[in-house]
Interface confidence: medium
């Protein structure tokens, strides 16, 4: 083992950690558990304890980021550097950062939790053997009802352990149908649909009717995503594998490496590759977040790399299911902190998460009838309308800043960013925000502290928008974006992650634009942005004045309010309404007087 010059270490034993944001690769509970287990490895052999806290004052701040993520040590895309950590100390010292361009897993492929079946909600095991064939994604083979399933062990033929994968044929999410599965085919606007669709929505989310006729019954749900078969790269990134698919006249019901010299698994994203040529790479095994975190936390505690190839602190990733700590790791950490007081601990045990619904034990083969029990429903909300109330705000939880004249929104000359969130207008300035609801005599509420509600954000924001269905909030500042879902944050991520080049210094606004699309603005340019894929179409770049003639070219904020577009320059706004495909300026006014209804005294 090796430590650092001067044996850098923590000088207290009760270490705190904060999970600042999450990767979308794993369920949050799995990420929480991976970090907790990684810390438990070190606490098991030392006097150290690790306590999760929820503030930036933590000793060890854990963050997912990509490329140059704000600390001077950029990540490098997929593979290569997986993560890095700083030595013990104040501020950023001791922090651990994980490259979100990696596929994070538990080391054995994407984590797909199952329902029903006979595996108590265990995750799929990829690859698995069924009838002598290897499967790297959920399959409908062996079933007549079209329900995708997987084995939860490496070999279904010998172990008979399985569960059902997320599927719209098994359940839907949210919507208003109590989680009932899709009914195919179904009628929507007089047309027949035999698969989930985004038609009728402007946000790109896939949905289905849960009865045969949506027009009559108005019952629907959203279709679950399938991490196991969401492709990367190729020419269809973010799409789902379609099984079976035809390639060179032959049918494939699982990912294949046929036609490639590098052994990488791929699939078609339509039923016929030969005619459509649409494809992508299937998810690989990914990196074990638990093992990488355990290694990084070793660094954050003061351990350098080990020269022992079997040690956890050896500088190469190696997946193992055995006990990760080698004697060399134990000697190193005890050199810094001493041994754990007697008695010696047992190895930490982990419990398998219980399924959300009581499993039904099925016959020895994957069942061919629907499970008798259905999943419990998600929240019921109107099918396509925005939320009925402000989704993220609430005066009860926000700290009101002591009032001074500058804290009156009516005295703010130029706001940093303005956004419609829920049914309210949010106005941001220098670390503070106000909320405004239109109505006779109403005044902006606030100011509140941004840091209280969205602690990961910087004081200065360039633009903000809410994605209405998922209630995701996108916050832009400089070359970075943060995405909040409730109190959880993903980011900061570089604008590169959204497909915006290095020449885009900031995002100055966003407007809704058709199904699942936004327009993102930066100065005089705009791009079409796919909300679901979180990616701009680089070919869609256009000049603002071509699409919105008559607005100023140096706007500092663009936002949508009451279905109209507002372009802000200085204290003024140019309001644009769309009529028969034409965007026309229909009003110019003051933000304070004309939107916030401030008195003109």
């Amino acid at each position: 083992f090796q430590t650092f010059e001067g044996d850098l270490k923590w000088h207290h034993h009760n270490i705190t950690y904060w999970i600042q944001n999450y990767s979308e690769d794993l369920p949050r509970a799995v990420i929480d558990d991976a970090f907790a287990r990684a810390f438990a490895l070190w606490s098991a052999v030392t006097p150290l304890t690790f306590t999760r806290v929820y503030s930036r004052d933590a000793d060890i701040v854990i963050q997912f980021g990509v490329a140059e993520h704000g600390d001077g040590y950029p990540f490098d895309g997929k593979d290569g550097l997986l993560a890095h950590a700083f030595p013990p100390g104040p501020g950023i010292q001791g922090d651990a950062h994980f490259d979100d361009d990696e596929l994070w897993s538990l080391g054995k492929g994407v984590v797909v939790p199952t329902r029903f079946g006979n595996a108590d909600g265990a995750a799929c095991h990829f690859p698995f053997i069924f009838e002598g064939r290897s499967y790297s994604a959920c399959t409908t083979d062996g079933r007549s009802d079209g329900l995708p399933w997987c084995s939860t062990t490496a070999n279904y033929d010998t172990d008979d352990r399985f569960g059902f994968c997320p599927s719209e044929r098994l359940y839907t999410q949210d919507g208003n149908a109590d989680g009932k599965p899709c009914q195919f085919p179904f009628i929507f606007q007089g047309q027949s649909y035999s698969a989930c669709t985004t038609d009728g929505r402007s946000d790109g989310y896939r949905w289905c009717a849960t009865t045969a006729n949506y027009d009559r019954d108005k019952l629907f749900g959203f279709c679950p995503t399938r991490a196991d078969s969401t492709v990367m790269g190729g020419n269809s990134a973010g799409e789902l594998c379609v099984f079976p698919f035809t390639f060179l006249g032959k049918e494939y019901s699982t990912c294949t490496s046929e036609g490639r010299g590098d052994g990488r698994l791929w699939c078609a994203t339509t039923s016929n590759f030969d005619s459509d040529k649409k494809w992508g790479f299937c998810p690989d095994q990914g990196y074990s977040l638990f093992l990488v975190a355990a290694h990084e936390f070793g660094h954050a505690l003061g351990l350098d790399h080990s020269s022992v190839p079997e040690a956890l602190m050896y500088p190469m990733y190696r997946f193992t299911e055995g006990p990760p700590l080698h004697k060399d790791d134990v000697n190193g950490i005890r050199h810094l902190y001493g041994p754990r007081p007697e008695p010696e601990p047992r190895p930490p045990t982990t419990t398998t998460p219980q399924p959300t619904a009581p499993p039904t034990v099925c016959p020895t083969g994957p069942p061919t009838v629907h499970p008798s029990e259905r999943p419990t429903a998600g929240p019921t909300g109107p099918p396509s309308a925005g939320p009925t109330g402000p989704p993220t705000a609430g005066p009860s939880t926000a700290t009101t800043v002591p009032l001074s004249p500058v804290d009156d929104a009516c005295n703010v000359n130029i706001f940093d960013a303005i956004a419609e969130i829920g049914n309210q207008l949010y106005l941001f300035k220098d670390g503070k925000y106000w909320r405004f609801s239109e109505g006779r005599g109403s005044r902006p509420q606030g100011p509140f502290l941004i840091a209280d509600k969205w602690p990961a954000l910087p004081r200065k924001l360039d633009s903000v928008f809410e994605e209405r269905l998922s209630k995701k909030l996108f916050f832009f500042s400089g070359r970075q974006v943060w995405v909040y879902t409730g109190a959880s944050v993903l980011g900061p991520r570089r604008l590169d992650k959204l497909g915006l080049g290095a020449d885009v210094a900031q995002v100055t606004g966003a407007l809704r634009s058709g199904r699942g699309k936004m327009l993102l603005f930066s100065g005089r340019r705009l791009w079409r942005f796919d909300v679901k894929a979180q990616m701009v179409d680089p070919r869609s770049a256009s000049e603002v004045d071509r699409m919105f003639p008559g607005v100023p070219l140096d706007t500092h904020d663009v936002f949508q309010y009451r279905e109209k577009a507002y372009f802000c320059q200085d204290r003024f706004y140019w309001r644009v309404s769309s009529r028969s495909e034409l965007n026309q300026v229909d009003q110019v006014g003051y933000v304070t007087y004309d939107i916030l209804q401030c008195p003109e005294d």
Epitope: G72, F75, H84, P90, H295
Partner: antibody, heavy 124, light 107 residues
Framework: EVQLLESGGGLVQPGGSLRLSCAAS???????HMWWVRQAPGKGLEWVS?????????LYADSVKGRFTISRDNSKNTLYLQMNSLRAEDTAVYYC?????????????????WGQGTLVTVSS | DIQMTQSPATLSLSPGERATLSCRAS??????LAWYQQKPGQAPRLLIY???YRATGIPARFSGSGSGTDFTLTISSLEPEDYAVYYC?????????FGQGTRLEIK
């Protein structure tokens, strides 16, 4: 003993190109973050470009963005800087520098080894 | 970008005297500061990393202190070989930036 040896400098006309190389020895090159730093005659130090250990991440000073390309060949323990569309203001001694930070253990701010430098003169 | 301002621009001292060189960042950089020494015709040499840690082979008369925005390089007793230009450099925020340098000359 750690050594960094630059080569490839010389006199070039404005708009021309040069490729600098930096041969590294005495350390595990593939694990370290590497840099190019330049110094115009009689002036201070200016960061030019950065590359991560795998080569997957590269960054550039605004003054050279779009004209210079940093790369590395870990099998040859060599760092490169391809300089195109050279301007008079690019005239400087170019140093390659090894970061103290390596692999996933970061936080050590400082370049602990530097090459002897190679002079690039852009003039007509 | 973070601006690094060094003072004084030139410092004239005699051998055996104590030298105090200052470096100020335009915003907080925690302890991510390094000091370099450069002699004419030579490459810079790392003296101090992370504000206060002496690099390998650097004599004990060199010490660094400070965090946040204000940093100091101290040479407790000047030796003839210490006369050179000294640069500070930050990595607390991207992009990294150098100070303009302090020339230490013999009085």
């Amino acid at each position: 003993e750690v050594q960094l040896l630059e080569s490839g400098g010389g006199l070039v006309q404005p708009g021309g190109s040069l490729r600098l190389s930096c041969a590294a020895s005495g350390f595990t090159f593939s694990r370290y973050h590497m840099w190019w730093v330049r110094q115009a005659p009689g002036k201070g130090l200016e960061w030019v470009s950065y590359i991560s250990p795998s080569g997957g991440s590269t960054l550039y000073a605004d003054s050279v963005k779009g004209r210079f390309t940093i790369s590395r060949d870990n099998s040859k323990n060599t760092l490169y800087l391809q300089m195109n569309s050279l301007r008079a203001e690019d005239t400087a001694v170019y140093y390659c520098a090894k970061d103290r930070a390596y692999g996933d253990y970061v936080g050590w701010n400082g370049f602990d080894y530097w090459g002897q430098g190679t002079l690039v003169t852009v003039s007509s | 970008d973070i601006q690094m301002t060094q003072s004084p621009a030139t410092l004239s001292l005699s051998p055996g005297e104590r030298a105090t060189l200052s470096c100020r960042a335009s915003q907080s950089i925690s302890s991510f500061l390094a000091w370099y020494q450069q002699k004419p015709g030579q490459a810079p040499r790392l003296l101090i990393y992370d504000a206060s840690y002496r690099a390998t082979g650097i004599p004990a008369r060199f010490s660094g202190s400070g965090s946040g925005t204000d940093f100091t390089l101290t040479i407790s007793s000047l030796e003839p070989e210490d006369y050179a230009v000294y640069y500070c450099q930050q990595r607390g925020n991207w992009p990294i930036t150098f100070g303009q340098g302090t020339r230490l000359e013999i009085k």
